[in-house]
């Protein structure tokens, strides 16, 4: 299991910027416009534009309320007029440089509209949002805009019982079959487009990936076994001409594996996914947050998957087929029969075109019938190194974003920012042999779940934005200035931070920084380069005989042990003479002359089998 975060920052301790509007709740849709330095925020009945550099500065707002008549009709259907029968913004996607595509639940009558960014007013198109946005604000959803067409995963009806992955397109609208083998009570988590590789084969197609958890079709138990999935469709899909008309011909799904090897620990509830794309990274990497189905202990894990691994399952893997196996929990088995040509579920690529299959519309019915009946792959998608990057106990992770940053020595590190259901943000760096949890920041005053996380990775200014029911918080990627000494700065093992001996401060590393000469950073936590020992200041105290002295010592690191020394001997709490407050401050009871002298508070932190010792405080005590 991963260690506890080294540092814990309380809500008011660090520089967080907040945005919220009184009376407005559910800030669950965030969209960044990097070129405009604007963050768009979709909340309940409202959309805001705020300054991305300082989100407390609101630029525009527009309200999209439900009429009383609609609210009443919704309430007549048994829904809550005060909460459910309102308009929760669920889709906030870029349509052009001057407009956004916005959809809301609209009192169980999902509706979409175009938001003009110049006037910041809705155009009043009021398109039917069925299949693009859920009816129920409590239902899962995901969407991504690709080439002006909205790809969505949501529910298609009032009850939420008909799941759908669809493409809203005037040219070629497509959707999944309403059949259990395709989607079985899914909980949608994430969707994104992966563009064809520039150095990949000619005529490749862009693909849209959907991540969700669904009830298993392949196994049947007394309880509903949940399985995390990745599905993909091809951007160029136009459906079939007869079989799979207006349906995906390229819809395939596979199981995502995230488990601790040689243990029964299986993480099968997908919470969130982030696609890491970075210069120097030869292919995108999917980072995913999981929790176990029976999570009474509060466990969470992060697994990472390469695009190549996912693609291999779909392009070369075996298929599964429905089977009646008596007295068995297994309901689907590997299909070992002949597979039609072209390969079912494959995109139309140059190879297909060479065989005259210029479009999915002229794929053979055999291929289409096969993919209609066999949407599930037998092969599973395994994580990088066949194990989770991180397993954390006593925490329920909700969202994840990942930044790839270059340390002072030129090495690239993946830094994960993972939010919790109690309003905290964990920051963890993936090192060669371990994951180091740098810090935990309490983003919200109250312990409320983080609903959405967004990373802005514009060079020179990087922030994490978190949305919750009560508002949005903006946090920098690092709080370097909070590390008061060289040792602290290095022990943080934060790739964004380095110690500047010139200004005797821990500074944020900017990629384009030229004056980083002489800066100190060591991702292994080696503090031996920290030569400028801080000037030893001391606190002088005078106490009366028989009294009690409290000597303060402030230690932030959760990984360090506080050691008190008197006349160079370590003090133990077991002695009736001494007591500790919060494992840090020292109490000395029944003071006498013999207690006069120098008391030192040291922090001892184990890093890579080495103990780093730091003097935190020095007290000179005189008993009169």
């Amino acid at each position: 299991f991963a260690p506890v975060p080294r540092l814990t920052w309380e809500h008011g301790e660090v520089g967080l910027v907040q945005f919220h509007k009184p009376g407005i709740f559910n800030y669950s849709a965030l969209l960044m416009s990097e070129d405009k330095d604007t963050l768009y925020v979709g909340a309940r009945e409202a959309v805001f534009a705020v300054n991305a550099l300082n989100i407390s500065e609101k630029q525009h707002e527009v309200y999209w309320k439900v009429s009383e008549d609609k609210k009443s009709k919704c309430a007549e259907k048994g829904k809550s007029k005060q909460t459910e029968c309102l308009n929760y913004i669920r889709v906030l996607q870029p349509l052009s440089s001057t407009s956004l595509y916005v959809c809301g639940t609209n009192a169980f009558q999902p509706t979409c509209d175009h938001l003009n960014l110049t006037s910041f007013k809705f155009l009043g198109k009021s398109e039917d949002g069925k299949g693009r946005c859920p009816f129920d604000p409590a239902h899962s959803y995901t969407s991504v805009m690709v080439g002006g067409e909205l790809y969505s995963g949501t529910s298609y009806n009032f009850l939420g019982s008909e799941p759908i992955i669809s493409r809203n397109s005037s040219h070629s609208p497509l959707r999944t079959e309403y059949a259990i083998p395709w989607l079985n009570e899914p909980s949608f988590v994430f969707a994104d487009v992966i563009q064809k590789s520039p150095d990949g084969p000619e005529g490749e197609d862009d693909k849209v990936y959907f991540f969700f958890t669904e009830v298993s079709v392949e196994y049947e138990f007394v309880f509903k076994l949940m399985i995390p999935r990745v599905a993909r469709v091809c951007k160029g899909d136009q459906g079939g001409l007869r079989t799979l008309q207006k349906k995906w011909t390229s819809f395939l799904k596979a199981r995502l594996i995230c488990s601790k090897p040689d243990s029964g620990l299986v993480f099968n509830i997908l919470q969130d996914v982030f696609v890491l794309r970075a210069p120097g990274l030869k292919e995108p990497v999917f980072y995913a947050v999981f929790t176990p189905q029976l999570n009474n202990v509060g466990l969470s894990a992060v697994c990472a998957y390469t695009l190549a691994t996912v693609e291999a399952v779909f392009s070369r893997g075996k298929y599964m087929q429905s089977a009646t196996v008596e007295q068995s929990h297994t309901k689907w088995v590997r299909y070992n029969g002949p597979v039609p040509t072209p390969r079912p579920g494959a995109c139309i690529d140059s190879e297909a075109r060479a065989a005259n299959y210029t479009s999915s519309l002229n794929l053979p019915d055999k291929t289409l019938q096969f993919v209609k009946d066999h949407p599930l792959m037998d092969d599973s998608v395994t994580p990088i190194d066949n194990r989770p990057k991180l397993i954390k106990k006593d925490v329920n992770y909700t969202q994840i974003v990942v930044d790839r940053t270059q340390a002072l020595d030129g090495t690239f590190y993946d830094v994960m920012f993972i939010s919790t259901d109690r309003g905290a943000l964990h920051k963890a760096v993936i090192l060669t042999k371990e994951v180091h949890v740098i810090e935990e920041t309490q983003l919200f005053r109250d312990s409320e779940p983080v609903l959405t996380l967004l990373l802005s990775s514009k060079k020179g200014r990087k922030f994490v934005y978190a949305g919750s029911n009560s508002g949005v918080v903006q946090a920098p990627l690092a709080f370097c200035e909070k590390h008061g000494s060289c040792e602290d700065c290095v022990l943080a093992r934060d790739p964004y931070c380095a110690w500047s001996p010139a200004i005797k401060a821990c500074v944020t590393l900017h990629q384009e920084e030229a004056s980083s000469r002489g800066w100190i950073q060591d991702m292994s936590g080696d503090t031996s380069s920290c030569l400028d020992k801080s000037k030893e200041s001391f606190n002088q105290h005078f106490f009366k005989h028989g009294g009690t002295a409290e000597l303060k010592c402030f230690q932030k690191s959760n990984l360090a042990r506080v050691v008190w020394k008197f006349q160079n001997g370590e003090l133990k709490a077991a002695s009736p003479k001494y007591g500790f407050v919060g494992r840090k401050h020292l109490l000395i009871f029944n003071l006498s002359d013999g207690d006069s002298g120098v008391y030192q508070c040291l922090s001892e932190e184990r890093v890579r089998n080495k103990t780093v010792s730091q003097l935190l405080a020095k007290h000179v005590l005189e008993v009169k």
Epitope: L241, K246, T358, L361, N362, P364, D365
Partner: antibody
Framework: QVTLKESGPTLVKPTQTLTLACSFS??????????VTWIRQPPGKALEWLAL???????YYSTSLKTRLTISKDTSKNQVVLTMTNMDPVDTATYYC??????????????WGQGTLVTVSS | SSELTQAPSVSVSPGQTASITCSGD??????VYWYQQKPGQPPVLVIY???KRPSGIPERFSGSNSGNTATLTISATQALDEADYYC???????????FGTGTKVTVL
């Protein structure tokens, strides 16, 4: 230029089997996505779809007439044949064959023959 | 169900708009095609895949498909548009093409 022409008997007795041929030119039934279909239209009535055969030799039939219909192709002769057993006077109609276009703009009955009127009478 | 229902007839004055509807269960899940047939001639396609117009078909012909109803609209109707119009779709549950009952358009 695509042309299709239906041929066969103009008069058939009840209970007999009707055999119709569709000879075509300007396209090949070996080309990916191409199909040939049969449609009929009783005098003064609506169009009724009968059967289809595609380049991959997939065959589809009208469910109400499935037991009576057989469609086949002879690619070397550029011909599609439809047989319909147990003819009845209600089967009196103009029988059309048509080419189904393929690809992005496909799916429709793109080119039609002029049709052949078949009368079922004793 | 394998039925496509059309109104038997529609009358329209020249220059006006004629709307011909075709109804069937969950029709928007299917592609709808529209054919025009004049007496003694084979049908001619006017709209394919719900709303696409083949080359050579005038712009006044347009199509839409939503819910259980597909509509063929002829705007600025001309005398030469007088004909029978059929909708058509592929019924995937029974693997067959189905034609509508047909609508006779009369230009007054």
């Amino acid at each position: 230029q695509v042309t299709l022409k239906e041929s066969g008997p103009t008069l058939v007795k009840p209970t007999q089997t009707l055999t119709l041929a569709c000879s075509f030119s300007g396209f090949s039934l070996t080309t990916t996505g191409v199909a040939v279909t049969w449609i009929r239209q009783p005098p003064g009535k609506a169009l009724e779809w009968l059967a289809l055969i595609d380049w991959d030799d997939d065959k589809y039939y009208s469910t109400s007439l499935k037991t009576r219909l057989t469609i086949s192709k002879d690619t070397s002769k550029n011909q599609v044949v439809l047989t319909m057993t147990n003819m009845d006077p209600v089967d009196t109609a103009t029988y059309y064959c048509a080419r189904i276009a393929s690809g992005d703009s496909g799916g429709y009955f793109a080119d039609w023959g002029q049709g052949t009127l078949v009368t079922v009478s004793s | 169900s394998s039925e496509l229902t059309q109104a038997p007839s529609v009358s329209v004055s020249p220059g006006q708009t004629a709307s011909i509807t075709c109804s069937g269960d969950k029709l928007d899940d299917k592609y709808v095609y529209w054919y025009q047939q004049k007496p003694g001639q084979p049908p001619v396609l006017v709209i394919y895949r719900d709303n696409k117009r083949p080359s050579g078909i005038p712009e006044r012909f347009s199509g839409s498909n939503s819910g259980n109803t597909a509509t063929l609209t002829i705007s600025a109707t001309q005398a030469l548009d007088e004909a029978d119009y059929y909708c058509q779709a592929w019924e995937s549950s029974s693997d067959q093409y189905v034609f509508g009952t047909g609508t006779k358009v009369t230009v007054l």
